[in-house]
């Protein structure tokens, strides 16, 4: 008789999840030799231990602490790039500007990027059929709690000038409900962070509006200013040219506004 299984609203665990996490860990420690001390089998064991045999709506940050400890990593605190709803461009940027880091350029972010996972209460099985959806089921699910935990730690580590890339094509350029708006903004440390600089990325080729005057950007400025952190904003009118100029800053066309 097949055992009854809870049906959640979200997609199930990414196929070959254990193998993917382990392989990514090994690859990361090769690409980043300063992390060669990391034992990837222990990392996987700690990752698994955070959600296996636990109710997938009852996960806490505490569950992830063993993994956080094993994945402890130092990134230059003044070279942090946050992003909201524009992940691909942020990652393209740090692939060129190699001394800057998004969360997904760290070991823990790299391990989990684009993956889904959850377990079941009282069984050691991984649920490949469905996992809780943040809105429809519960917010304390394994994936959401993981990203909340690592995002908080990443923001807490930031110092000096912190950059954030925002999507100017969205109705809410700054969204209070995004991970950036709900977690990272509130965990920047005013005693360490001097300025948050927003880069608003334009979508349309003929879009010459100053999106730094957008009401949601003004809202972000207000939140940041109340936290005693300075705020600045730049329009990136041509993201393609922006990336090209990061690659080749000597190019004569790169002196004009991008």
């Amino acid at each position: 008789v097949p055992r009854w299984r809870q049906q959640w609203s979200g997609p199930g665990t990414t196929k070959r999840f254990p193998e993917t996490v382990l392989a990514r860990c090994v690859k990361y420690t090769e690409i980043h030799p300063e992390m060669r001390h990391v034992d990837c089998q222990s990392v996987w064991d700690a990752f698994k231990g955070a959600f296996i045999s636990k109710h997938p709506c009852n996960i806490t940050e505490e569950d992830y602490q063993p993994l956080m400890k094993l994945g402890t990593q130092t990134v230059p605190c003044n070279k942090i790039l946050l992003w909201s709803r524009i992940k691909d461009l942020a990652h393209q940027f740090t692939q060129v500007q190699r001394d800057m880091f998004t969360l997904e350029d760290t070991l823990l972010g790299y391990l989990a990027d684009d993956l889904t996972w959850c377990g079941e209460f009282n069984t050691s099985k991984i649920n490949y059929q469905s996992c809780p959806d943040w809105r429809k089921d519960c917010s304390n699910n394994p994936v959401s709690v993981f990203w909340k935990t690592v995002s908080r730690r990443f923001a807490e580590a930031a110092c000096d000038v912190v950059h954030v890339m925002l999507n100017g094509s969205r109705s809410k350029i700054f969204d209070k409900n995004s991970t950036f708006g709900s977690v990272e903004v509130h965990n920047l440390q005013p005693e360490k962070v001097q300025t948050l600089e927003a880069w608003v990325i334009h979508g349309g080729r003929e879009d010459s509006r100053d999106l730094c005057q957008d009401p949601t950007i003004k809202e972000l400025e207000s939140i940041i200013s109340k936290r005693n952190i300075q705020f600045s904003c730049k329009n990136i009118y041509r993201p393609d040219k922006f990336l090209q100029c990061v690659k080749n800053p000597e190019d004569s066309s790169c002196t004009s506004e991008i």
Partner: antibody
């Protein structure tokens, strides 16, 4: 760990040094190359990872090539100059330092 | 590029005395503690003494100790013995994607009287 291949070469003549390891597997460790000119200090050239990804000092890029087989790690000096005269060391890179196990070194002399 | 500056370049000590060697990095080493010390005697390869700023490598006498953080590090030899006459090198580690992975200091020669 033992280096070999060091000899007298004329400027511009490519030279390959070989590092052989015994008692451990090269697939389990990063391996580093370091050199020391006569009477001078240690200079890190580069290393090769477990899966053969290479990293070089900024000054060494283009001047050296590191490669490996299952039994040895090679350092190719692409176009030696007299400034490349040095003892070349191969070292096993451990988790937290540039090397916990070093070979005795092999001397390369570049002279016309 | 990052630079590790060792001082002094040469130091003389009596048997039983104390030697202090400083190493200053032009930027913080990885994790503020990824700094090692090597001993090299004439005609020999370097030997790892200390890793991660203060951890003693296997078989190294406890008279060797390391301290520091970030950009400033110190190697101390307490109760110097004649066998300690050698050159000493600090070695820092940095994030490879944006800098040289490893950098050595210029060395300090220790002479034991």
């Amino acid at each position: 760990v033992e280096e070999s291949g060091g000899r007298l070469v004329t400027p511009g003549t490519p030279l390959t040094l070989t590092c052989t390891a015994s008692g451990f597997s090269l697939s389990s460790y990063y391996m580093s190359w370091v050199r020391q000119a006569p009477g001078k200090g240690l200079e890190w050239i580069g290393f090769i990872s477990k899966t053969a990804i290479t990293y070089y000092a900024s000054w060494a890029r283009g001047r050296f090539t590191i490669s490996k087989t299952s039994t040895a790690v090679d350092l190719k000096i692409t176009s030696p100059t007299t400034e490349d005269t040095a003892t070349y060391f191969c070292a096993r890179v451990d988790a937290y330092s540039a090397g916990d196990l070093w070979g005795p070194g092999t001397l390369v002399t570049v002279s016309s | 590029a990052q630079v590790l500056t060792q001082t002094p370049s040469s130091v003389s000590a009596a048997v039983g005395g104390t030697v202090t060697i400083n190493c200053q990095a032009s930027q913080s080493v990885y994790s503020d503690n990824r700094l090692s010390w090597f001993q090299q005697k004439s005609g020999q390869p370097p030997k790892l003494l200390i890793y991660s700023t203060s951890s003693l490598a296997s078989g190294v006498p406890s008279r060797f100790s390391g301290s520091g953080s970030g950009t400033q590090f110190t190697l101390t030899i307490s109760g110097v013995q004649s066998d300690d006459a050698a050159s000493y090198y600090c070695q820092g580690e940095f994030i490879c994607t944006s800098a040289d992975c490893f950098v050595f200091g210029g060395g300090t020669e220790v002479v034991v009287k």
